[in-house]
């Protein structure tokens, strides 16, 4: 092995380099010293480093490492942050459109029910938004509340408009009768099923994206241990003490050091891979009744159908409710009277199937494809960081932590390090508490994602089919089946494309299908066009 080059007799180069790190030269010896007080850059001869310099190098090494880690994750972080924000905004827009569609349906078909219907619809969709954003609200309660509120208004305004004002105290009786008599048939249950399934999936999708951000933020801001700081210092700076300013660390040596420093972080890898694959599975199942865009934008039609169902049964209902609520002031508001079965419309309820082009669905899949390119992010981190910091190619004429070598030998390097610092010990310490916490959160979300992954076969649940509804598929080439009944309905070939291209922002006055065009809200439209088109500033 070649002898080390002669050290700088005046430590001049070391002084000028160190001054860039730490203004002032009081810590730098003018000429090489024995360095017996050094703890990291243990000298084999005279050295241009002091204990204070060594401490500064350690601090700088740890900061460098943190910056390298942050730049390594910047593209991934940007991808998830932007998509989480874009999807959340897009879901809010879908909810707003769904509300406007429903209000427009009431205005066009049942003007006598407004403005009360608008109030109930508004409250329902507020609950939907709160649920998506993580509120602990029960979907069945939300749907029940919508129908509980609507029925007294439907009864007093549509079915029995001649009721005197004094009879309005029957509202409470009607509210109870709504459930007891199943006045809307199975429509409330159908809506509960569709809304709960689609919103659950939407909510967990957003939760998963937000956890992804939290994972990156956690590993992004890791504070590296003093042991790691010593290893990094030895790799990046100890050569300077010998006046070897231009020498680069050996690549193999860098990998060993990085694997030691990042042993805890790399433990995330298994759960990160599972996270991306589970998220992909979830996204693959987000269609039909598991797609909130599809379900919510079709709700106006199902609610319309449910009101038509009430109207079809108006004769029997009016008679029954006349008996039930005649003495509403005297009776306790709980019905014990169950009439003979009302007319049940065994209508084929077809659940809409949205073409995937230009919809939120295609954007979700695009995001997954981009995320999958980061599936090995954590296992590849040590290598990535070494490839983005100065290392000698081919491990020739490089620094191995103690001296300049012609060729790097991992065994020799490890033997040389034993008396200074035990790499194996660092690995055995296990992950930082914050890393352990984030691993626990990943385990939890992965379990949720697995639980939520959809059965692919049938559109409607079996129990719904058994209760008087038949599930029917819309052919892929057909127009949507979602708004097939009633005046003023629309057939939606492709919902978000419809929203984007026609630039509708429906107000109450703009019924679905009405000819007048509202002023487009540019920010909403651009949201759909730009959804998921994430271009990292690094690319």
């Amino acid at each position: 092995q070649p002898p080390p080059p002669p050290p700088d007799a005046t430590c001049h180069q070391v002084r000028s380099f160190f001054q860039r790190l730490q203004p002032g030269l009081k810590w730098v010896p003018e000429t090489p010293v024995p360095g017996s007080d050094l703890q990291v850059c243990l000298p084999k001869g005279p050295t241009c480093c002091s204990r204070k310099m060594e401490e500064k190098y350690q601090l700088t090494a740890r900061l460098n490492m943190e910056q390298l880690l942050q730049s390594a994750s910047m593209e991934l972080k940007f991808l998830i942050i932007q998509n989480a924000a874009v999807f959340q905004e897009a879901f809010e827009i879908v909810v707003r459109h769904a509300k406007n569609y429903t209000n427009a349906m009431f205005k066009n078909n049942y003007p006598s029910l407004t403005p009360q219907a608008f109030e109930f619809v508004g409250e329902f969709f507020t609950d939907v938004s709160l649920y998506i954003l993580g509120s602990d609200i029960n979907v069945d309660d939300m749907v029940n509340e919508l129908f509980d509120s609507l029925f007294p208004v439907i009864y007093t305004q549509l079915m029995n408009p001649g009721l005197p004002d004094s009879a309005l105290d029957i509202n409470e009786c009607l509210r109870g009768a709504r459930r007891d008599l199943k006045v809307f048939g199975n429509f409330p249950k159908l809506i509960m099923t569709q809304v709960s399934k689609s919103l659950q999936v939407t909510r967990i999708f957003l939760q998963a994206l937000n956890l992804g951000i939290e994972v990156i933020n956690t590993t992004d801001h890791l504070k590296f241990s003093k042991d790691c700081g010593r290893m990094l210092t030895r790799m990046w700076y100890c050569s300077y003490c010998q006046g070897l300013m231009m020498v680069k660390p050996c690549g193999g040596y860098c990998n060993v050091v990085m694997q030691g420093c990042m042993a805890g972080v790399v433990e995330i890898d298994k759960y990160w891979r599972e996270y991306i694959l589970s998220l992909e599975e979830l996204v693959n199942g987000m269609y039909r009744i598991y797609d909130m865009e599809n379900v919510l934008l079709g709700l106006f039609s199902t609610i319309h159908d449910s009101i038509q169902y009430v109207q079809k049964n108006a004769g029997k209902l009016t008679t029954t409710i006349g008996k039930l609520c005649a003495h509403s002031q005297q009776r306790q508001y709980r019905s014990a009277y169950y009439p003979e079965d009302l007319f049940i419309d065994k209508k084929v309820l077809k659940v809409a199937h949205v073409e995937h082009e230009e919809t939120l669905s295609s954007r979700r899949r695009e995001l997954i494809q981009k995320l999958k390119s980061f599936i090995s992010f954590y296992s590849a981190l040590p290598g990535y960081i070494c490839s983005h910091s100065p290392v000698a190619e081919n491990d020739t004429l490089c620094w191995n932590g103690q001296e300049l070598v012609e060729r790097y030998s991992q065994k020799a390097a490890r033997n040389g390090m034993k008396n200074q610092f035990n790499l194996h010990e660092l690995k055995m310490k296990g992950p930082e508490p914050v890393v352990s916490q984030i691993i626990d959160k990943l385990k939890h979300i992965n379990q949720l994602l697995r639980t939520m992954s959809m059965p692919k076969g049938r559109v409607l649940d079996k129990n719904l089919d058994e209760e008087g509804f038949e599930s029917g598929d819309c052919g892929d080439d057909e127009d949507e089946c979602i708004g097939g009944s009633g005046d003023g309905m629309i057939k939606v070939k492709n919902q978000l494309r419809f929203l984007a291209e026609l630039a509708y922002d429906l107000d109450v006055d703009d019924a679905p299908g009405n000819s007048q065009q509202a002023t487009p809200k540019d920010n909403e439209i651009s949201t759909f066009h730009n959804l998921g088109n994430v271009h990292s500033p690094l690319k």
Epitope: T126, S129, D136, D141
Partner: antibody, heavy 121, light 110 residues
Framework: QVQLQESGGGLVQPGRSLRLSCAAS????????MTWVRQAPGKGLEWVSS????????YYADSVKGRFTISRDNSKNTLYLQMNSLRAEDTAVYYC??????????????WGQGTLVTVSS | QSALTQPPSASGSPGQSVTISCTGT?????????VSWYQQYPGKAPKLLIY???NRPSGVPDRFSGSKSGTSASLAITGLQAEDGADYYC??????????FGGGTKVTVL
Amino acid sequence: QVQLQESGGGLVQPGRSLRLSCAASGFTFSTYAMTWVRQAPGKGLEWVSSISSSGESTYYADSVKGRFTISRDNSKNTLYLQMNSLRAEDTAVYYCAKDRRGSHADAFDVWGQGTLVTVSS
Amino acid sequence: QSALTQPPSASGSPGQSVTISCTGTSSDVGGYNYVSWYQQYPGKAPKLLIYGNSNRPSGVPDRFSGSKSGTSASLAITGLQAEDGADYYCQSYDSSLRVVFGGGTKVTVL
């Protein structure tokens, strides 16, 4: 007419338990969310706990979480508040309130007259 | 959860107007959430005046009106009457659906 009547209040020692009840009449109890609100002497209103119409969802103020439990029996039109590990700062008039809606606490359109709970040794 | 912020007192002569403010955060008043207002006389239970930011239950005079903008809400009483002297509380809920009240405003009719 619509009415809420609280009962079960009284004097209790710190660390002990008490169960408040609220009997509802004049409305379809099972379709509305219900809430307990308290008011310490000379102080403002403080929300304690809420429960959705089905009883599936319950919500608690941080100050009572883990000590108080809200529940309802829709067949009896009754709301309950089980108060354990009572403290001096729990002394207040406890109001039972009906929500306008069923899904969660939003606005309280009917209130009981309140029952006084005094926690003192 | 911290209380919404209300001024402790407000006053006006009969026939005048009084406005009470209620300030919250983006997670309660400023979110999707609705604001309600209550009137309370000493020793009595509160009474709902406004729900859903600006809606009046039947029986509440139209002298009372509510509004919401951003993270603030306000209750306006026009044509102040002697019986309007009472405590007024705003109320909303946060993103966890936990209810939050304001500290209360004592309105004095001079």
